[in-house]
Interface confidence: medium
């Protein structure tokens, strides 16, 4: 299974549901289907209120039963560990794959945690995080923000994914905007130096 790198904002915007939840145990194979399901305990819903309607929560996360079909394999044995899960809604059920944005909540930077709760939503449907695969990259539209973490950091985990969101600057322009939470190392040019 091959997954394209995803900026957290893209994961948020492209998902039907974004929740915080704990995994309660091993997966259960669903007979006669190619799916298995993990029992989860949802602690907070961050996106999907409209899609879910009056449902009170999700007890299961469904995923393909085989890794070759991009099935998600949950490796942590810690049932008290909280995860951020960005998934799709199918037939009223939460579906995830190996490519889903699914990470321990505490692994997210404070800026990302804040953004998942309230900031990323402001860019959905308006702004696009545009991955840069070779320098120089070209912005195809003023509603795009160039995402350069992969080429400069060799990973999708970099300054832009950790500390920036692509948000509307005005009705015709989206730009990277600093999420304003202190960082462990100084960010080049993100603040004035006295």
């Amino acid at each position: 299974c091959s997954c394209a790198p995803t900026h957290p904002q893209t994961a948020f915007c492209n998902s039907d549901l974004v929740i915080r939840a704990k995994f309660m145990g091993s997966p259960e194979i669903i007979e006669t289907t190619l799916y298995q399901r993990y029992e989860i305990k949802m602690t907070k819903m961050l996106k999907g209120f409209d899609a879910v309607g009056n449902a009170t929560g999700f007890r299961f996360a469904y995923t393909p039963a085989m890794e070759s079909l991009c099935g998600y394999v949950h490796k942590s044995q810690n049932r008290s560990e909280e995860f951020l899960i960005a998934g799709r809604l199918r037939n009223g059920n939460l579906h995830i794959t190996a490519c889903s944005f699914l990470v321990p909540w505490h692994n997210l930077s404070p800026a990302q945690q804040k953004a998942f709760v309230k900031t990323y939503s402001a860019g959905c449907g308006v702004c696009t995080v545009f991955p840069c695969s070779a320098i120089p990259c070209k912005l195809e539209s003023d509603s795009h923000c160039l995402w350069t973490d992969q080429i400069l950091m060799g990973s999708e985990k970099g300054y832009q994914s950790d500390h920036f969101a692509c948000l509307p600057r005005n009705p015709d322009l989206c730009t990277w905007q600093y999420l304003g939470v202190s960082m462990t190392r100084s960010l080049p040019l993100a603040k004035a130096e006295a």
């Epitope: 840069c132 320098i135 120089p136 070209k138 912005l139 003023d142 923000c145 160039l146 350069t148 080429i151 400069l152 950091m153 060799g154 300054y159 832009q160 500390h163 920036f164 600057r169 322009l173 730009t175 990277w176 905007q177 600093y178 100084s186 960010l187 080049p188 040019l189 993100a190 603040k191 004035a192 130096e193």
Partner: antibody, heavy 119, light 108 residues
Framework: QVQLVQSGAEVKKPGSSVKVSCKAS????????ISWVRQAPGQGLEWMGG????????NYAQKFQGRVTITADESTSTAYMELSSLRSEDTAVYYC????????????WGQGTLVTVSS | DIVLTQSPATLSLSPGERATLSCRAS???????LAWYQQKPGQAPRLLIY???SRATGVPARFSGSGSGTDFTLTISSLEPEDFAVYYC?????????FGQGTKVEIK
């Protein structure tokens, strides 16, 4: 195609100031960092400082702190570098260069502006 | 400040030969933050390599970069006439974002 077009050559007296402009076209000005790099005759490259237009705040190399001011005007997609208290050793070609936020990797450069400081 | 020391200062080679340029940092630099530029007389620098080893768009395959930590190398596998120029390494790991003093590759 991205272009950075700088203002023309300047001759200045010691103690005076110079302000060089850098007008960007062909790209989204606000989505990048603009840095200034200088090169004295026959010498290497020296980063002076830079600005991210959407933040409006700049940072500077310690060497130039207090003498250089970098600003940006989003409405005209133009960045400016002003250097004060000029001395003869400030004679150099001054380049503006575009970098990806929040990185200082310069993929496009202006043509350079020669500033000569002479009495 | 991170000091980048390039060697040799001048490299005299003939077209078709291999050029190996060195850049040594005074302290460790993440390879993600190391770039190489080419500058010809009267022109602005041109980005060649970023992330220590990735070629910028339009840069011929004869240019390659390698290294990590404090030692980085730019290699030109077979010099073409247009490759004779000055080459600079740059770090953008920490402010101020410093350049090496340059290596001039000249025709022998």
């Amino acid at each position: 195609q991205v272009q950075l077009v700088q203002s023309g050559a300047e001759v200045k007296k010691p103690g005076s100031s110079v302000k060089v402009s850098c007008k960007a076209s062909g790209g989204t000005f606000s989505s990048y960092a603009i840095s200034w790099v200088r090169q004295a005759p026959g010498q290497g490259l020296e980063w002076m400082g830079g600005i991210i237009p959407i933040f409006g705040t700049a940072n500077y190399a310690q060497k130039f702190q207090g003498r250089v001011t970098i600003t940006a005007d989003e409405s005209t997609s133009t960045a400016y570098m002003e250097l004060s208290s000029l001395r003869s050793e400030d004679t150099a070609v001054y380049y503006c260069a575009r970098g990806y936020i929040p990185y200082h990797l310069f993929d496009y450069w202006g043509q350079g502006t020669l500033v000569t400081v002479s009495s | 400040d991170i000091v980048l020391t390039q060697s040799p200062a001048t490299l005299s080679l003939s077209p078709g030969e291999r050029a190996t340029l060195s850049c040594r940092a005074s302290q460790s630099v993440s390879s993600s933050y190391l770039a190489w530029y080419q500058q010809k007389p009267g022109q602005a620098p041109r980005l060649l390599i970023y992330g220590a080893s990735s070629r910028a768009t339009g840069v011929p395959a004869r240019f390659s970069g390698s290294g990590s930590g404090t030692d980085f190398t730019l290699t030109i596998s077979s010099l073409e006439p247009e490759d004779f120029a000055v080459y600079y390494c740059q770090q953008f790991n920490d402010s101020p974002y410093t350049f090496g003093q340059g290596t001039k590759v000249e025709i022998k």
